[in-house]
Interface confidence: low
């Protein structure tokens, strides 16, 4: 067959859908690879072709679009299942082609079973709510395009296994779920079930997401360096190991990049010749405040090293701070014979 630009298997798009529910899957060519829309391709005389490889098979086969009740159909660049079956699991390929051009990409589709409490192998998106921050909402995700705006679906919300009714601080409002004051106790999995009619049939869409309550921006502060500090002096003799921890507290900040680094005499450790190793550990509080520790280690410190300036730096979206460690050479204890002898005036 003629050459085709093959983007391979796009495992970044591990699509998971629930069994016995509608699913609409856009050809990833237009979203991630070719960067122009189906209409442009279509008006340029290109045709979109779909085929698939069943789970545990190697044979590529066409998709049967002539199933009863149009169970699988294609509309523009979307492949529709109304509804899915477990054995729809496999690798799906969309191919865009005409007589002179061909481009294709494959992606895995997994049809997943859920239990009565909505537990499943589905990877869940995480939605972060700020602790004690006033009213915040989550929205039932990925339901656009399933029904026209003229159709009014019914939406039921659950926390874990339990229908959300008469909860103290959580109120269902159609597609939204409002948290009056988010607390740690609101952490958990929330599910919306959207029910809508289509051509005399009733379909359900189940969407579960994880809510994680995190530190509020109202309480956020610039990074706080706990160590090094003014109370600890790192006194070493040449030849000893120098270990200086830099311990920094970062308030949780959405999408903030927390950074900790050391400089030695104003340079990054990588840019100097001394043999330095840096080990980092990270821990989180329940509200995702972060404590980072970077331990600077020089195995056999020299007297030159003990004269250097060691500064710990930290940066987040709230600001940048720095703190120098107090490093000095240990003064050797007096050697009795020599120093006492000098004291008695011996020559």
């Amino acid at each position: 067959s003629e050459r085709c630009d093959d983007w391979g298997l796009d495992t970044m798009r591990q699509i998971q859908v629930f069994e016995d529910e509608p699913a609409r899957i856009k050809c990833p060519l237009f979203e991630h690879f070719l960067k122009f829309n189906y209409s442009t391709a279509h008006s340029a005389g290109l045709t979109l072709i779909w085929y698939w490889t069943r789970q545990d098979r190697d044979l590529e086969e066409p998709i049967n679009f002539r199933l009863p009740e149009n169970r699988i159909s294609k509309e523009k660049d979307v492949l529709w299942f109304r509804p899915t079956l477990l054995n729809d699991t496999g690798n799906y390929t969309c191919m865009l082609r005409n007589t002179t051009y061909c481009s294709k990409v494959a992606f895995p589709l997994e049809v997943v079973q859920k239990d009565s409490c909505f537990n499943s192998p589905m990877k869940l998106p995480v939605h972060k709510l700020y602790i004690e921050y006033g009213i915040q909402r989550i929205t039932c995700p990925n339901v656009d395009g399933y029904f026209p705006s003229s159709v009014k679906p019914t939406i039921t919300w659950y926390m874990g296994c339990y229908k959300i009714q008469n909860f103290n601080n959580v109120i269902p409002e159609g597609m939204n779920l409002s948290f009056l004051i988010a607390l740690i106790s609101n952490n958990g999995n929330y599910t919306c079930v959207v029910t809508y009619p289509e051509n005399g049939r009733t379909f359900h869409l189940t969407r579960t997401l994880t809510v994680k309550v995190v530190g509020s921006p109202k309480n956020a502060v610039p990074p706080v360096i706990h160590s090094p500090n003014d109370h600890v002096v790192y006194e070493k003799e040449p030849g000893e190991e120098l270990l200086i921890p830099c311990t920094v507290y970062f308030s949780f900040l959405m999408d903030s990049r927390n950074e900790v680094w050391w400089t030695i005499d104003g340079k990054k450790p990588d840019d100097i010749t001394i043999d330095v190793t840096i080990n980092e550990s990270i821990s989180h509080s329940r509200t995702e405040d972060e404590t980072r520790t970077q331990i600077l280690s020089i195995k056999k410190v020299t007297s030159e090293d003990l004269k250097r300036s060691y500064v710990c730096h930290a940066r987040s979206a709230k600001g940048e701070v720095a703190k120098a460690a107090k490093v000095k050479q240990k003064v050797p204890a007096p050697r009795y014979t020599v120093e006492l002898a000098c004291g008695f005036g011996a020559t």
Epitope: K35, G45, Y101
Partner: antibody, heavy 119, light 108 residues
Framework: QVQLLQSGAEVKKPGSSVKVSCKAS????????IDWVRQAPGQGLEWMGG????????NSAQKFQGRVTITADKSTSTAYMELSSLRSEDTAVYYC????????????WGQGTMVTVSS | EIVLTQSPGTLSLSPGERATLSCRAS???????LAWFQQRPGQAPRLLIY???RRATGIPDRFSGSGSGTDFTLTISRLEPEDFAVYYC?????????FGGGTKVEIK
């Protein structure tokens, strides 16, 4: 930052042809459509046609079919529009425009090339 | 082909006023593929709005788009001196791509 740089102004005789170039710099060229739009003096915008360089196939408005040739050279990231059998009413500014990185609309335009057709 | 009709042809307003520009399509615009462009004298057009209502990168929020099907509107909430220009709507959902005739927003 992506830029579209067009060739300079042209003065042509009726019946001749003109070829305008549009070079893309600073970004991916072949995966976006490059379209051509013209604007006669004091008039509105008129779509002529476009090409998706990775496809190599162009499409054009029926009005220009048979007279316009749109091509692209992926190696130089340059698109070309050639209009033949020129007449005085083809006097216009010719723009190239990129059909969408974030959208499918013309999100990036060249500076325009003035083509004057005069005997 | 889809014919786009813009109205009014000219809009005379003062800085600080609200401008409402209309674009009507002869057929329904596929998948809401409708854009608005601004063109100042001697310059290339600049994308303001795409997908009916989505602002392009760097466009101030005083510009907003709305509508569906065949009727679309561009609104400039408070005209700034640099907003006096010609505005074009364009549908890019079906070939041939077409532009409206333009609305000139001039200083009163």
């Amino acid at each position: 930052q992506v830029q579209l740089l067009q060739s300079g102004a042209e003065v042509k005789k009726p019946g001749s042809s003109v070829k305008v170039s549009c070079k893309a710099s600073g970004g991916t060229f072949s995966i976006y459509a490059i379209d051509w739009v013209r604007q006669a003096p004091g008039q509105g915008l008129e779509w002529m046609g476009g090409i998706i360089p990775i496809f190599g196939t162009a499409n054009s408005a029926q009005k220009f079919q048979g007279r316009v040739t749109i091509t692209a050279d992926k190696s130089t990231s340059t698109a070309y529009m050639e209009l033949s059998s020129l007449r005085s009413e083809d006097t216009a500014v010719y723009y190239c425009a990129r059909n969408g990185a974030t959208s499918d609309a013309f999100d990036m335009w060249g500076q325009g090339t003035m083509v004057t057709v005069s005997s | 082909e889809i014919v786009l009709t813009q109205s009014p042809g000219t809009l005379s307003l003062s800085p600080g006023e609200r401008a409402t520009l209309s674009c009507r399509a002869s057929l329904s615009v596929s998948s809401n593929y409708l854009a608005w462009f601004q063109q100042r004298p001697g310059q290339a057009p600049r994308l303001l709005i795409y997908g009916v209502s989505r602002r392009a990168t760097g466009i101030p929020d005083r510009f907003s788009g709305s509508g569906s099907g065949t009727d679309f509107t561009l609104t400039i909430s408070r005209l700034e001196p640099e907003d006096f220009a010609v505005y074009y709507c364009q549908q890019y959902g079906s070939s041939p791509l077409t532009f409206g005739g333009g609305t000139k927003v001039e200083i009163k």
